[in-house]
Interface confidence: medium
């Protein structure tokens, strides 16, 4: 049994707040029509609401978000040679979070 | 296009490292046979490796982990009254990460 490793500390709730998450920049965000390219970087950090609330009827939701455009490199492969282009991807960062009732519509500013 | 909101900064790669994530403590982790109870807290923070690597043949993987037992409250509902018990859940924290080739076997300490 693994229980003997250390004394069990009381578990602390992961409160509803913004945390750093990894967002994968999929190629479809850059170009839906062509798959013959790479994106750099393949992933970036975003701020997202996570954690849990006091009961199942409420969820951790963003109350304020911000759109953040970032520039990525689109590396097209043409006749086995790389051609470097630039593209813009708009990321969504969560700025503030709140435990909200599941069915409630929420204004996002 | 949203590019006019602000100037697009160059995207920075989300490097392979430990980040704080939220781990859901599901009831089945506590008791397989009985669904007539609640777990508190319903979720906790863990440290997990995330981020991306230079190419698709490598993945961000933990190289060192720690198993951490935590004590949760199992709140049984008996004749509409709550009975408080304790249970232990073993969490896994990642302590160190590395970009490793996908198929490589890896020792974990």
């Amino acid at each position: 049994s693994l229980g003997s490793l250390t004394i069990a500390e009381p578990a602390m709730i992961a409160e509803c707040k913004t945390r750093t998450e990894v967002f994968e920049i999929s190629r479809r965000l850059i170009d839906r029509t062509n798959a013959n390219f790479l994106v750099w970087p393949p992933c970036v950090e975003v701020q997202r609401c996570s954690g849990c609330c006091n009961n199942r009827n409420v969820q951790c939701r963003p109350t304020q978000v911000q759109l953040r455009p970032v520039q990525v490199r689109k590396i097209e492969i043409v006749r086995k040679k790389p051609i470097f282009k630039k593209a813009t991807v708009t990321l969504e960062d969560h700025l503030a979070c709140k435990c909200e009732t599941v069915a409630a519509a929420r204004p996002v500013t | 296009s949203l590019g006019s909101l602000t100037i697009a900064e160059p995207a920075m790669i989300a490097e392979c490292k430990t980040r704080t994530e939220v781990f859901e403590i599901s009831r089945r982790l506590i008791d397989r046979t009985n669904a007539n109870f609640l777990v508190w807290p319903p979720c906790v923070e863990v440290q997990r490796c995330s981020g991306c690597c230079n190419n698709r043949n490598v993945q961000c993987r933990p190289t060192q982990v720690q198993l951490r037992p935590v004590q949760v409250r199992k709140i049984e509902i008996v004749r509409k009254k709550p009975i408080f018990k304790k249970a232990t859940v073993t969490l896994e924290d990642h302590l160190a990460c590395k970009c490793e080739t996908v198929a490589a076997a890896r020792p974990v300490t």
Epitope: - | F23, E24, I25, R32, C49, P62, L67, V89, T90, L91
Partner: antibody, heavy 120, light 107 residues
Amino acid sequence: EVQLVESGGGLVQPGGSLRLSCAASGFTFSSYWMSWVRQAPGKGLEWVSTISDGGGTTSYADSVKGRFTISRDNSKNTLYLQMNSLRAEDTAVYSCAESGGATDYLFDYWGQGTLVTVSS
Amino acid sequence: DIQMTQSPSSLSASVGDRVTITCRASQSISSYLNWYQQKPGKAPKLLIYAASSLQSGVPSRFSGSGSGTDFTLTISSLQPEDFATYYCQQSYITPLTFGGGTKVEIK
């Protein structure tokens, strides 16, 4: 409803490689340890490997150690088994199974399995 | 490695019979013993865990007992749907090991 669906099996020559996948749904995949168990035709059950919920702790049967690698992608709710240097005795139906918590090395729910045949 | 020995390897019984299957571990495994049922062409199903705890949704005619090295699975009154192969498994230590199985057939 818990669902585990394996894929990637097939016929492979001795010494060859194969990668099995197990797509999970109906439960919080990232909260559970997962395993691979195999069953040779007409034989009993044999544990192959187990991986922790976060992917950092792995364990293997001696018969596959150094040849097989278990991994998972929690963002895709998928479990993998990379099988290298395959041998005739690896021929079996490979099933993924949900293994409960860290102190619980058992198998709550199973997939239907995918057949791996190693033959020249 | 811990060896798990099941007996008998097969048995014939009738509907309504009381059936007992035994499983012996080569060393003490406390109560870390689980029982599974497998029907032909189907995935195994967990019946009993921790030697005597009934898995959710499993009929109460199935029961488990024992600790240390000797364990028993009992079906109090065999039903038509119970004809299958039963496996024990120790979850005390890796490598995890199964018994060889007991096939319960119709008499």
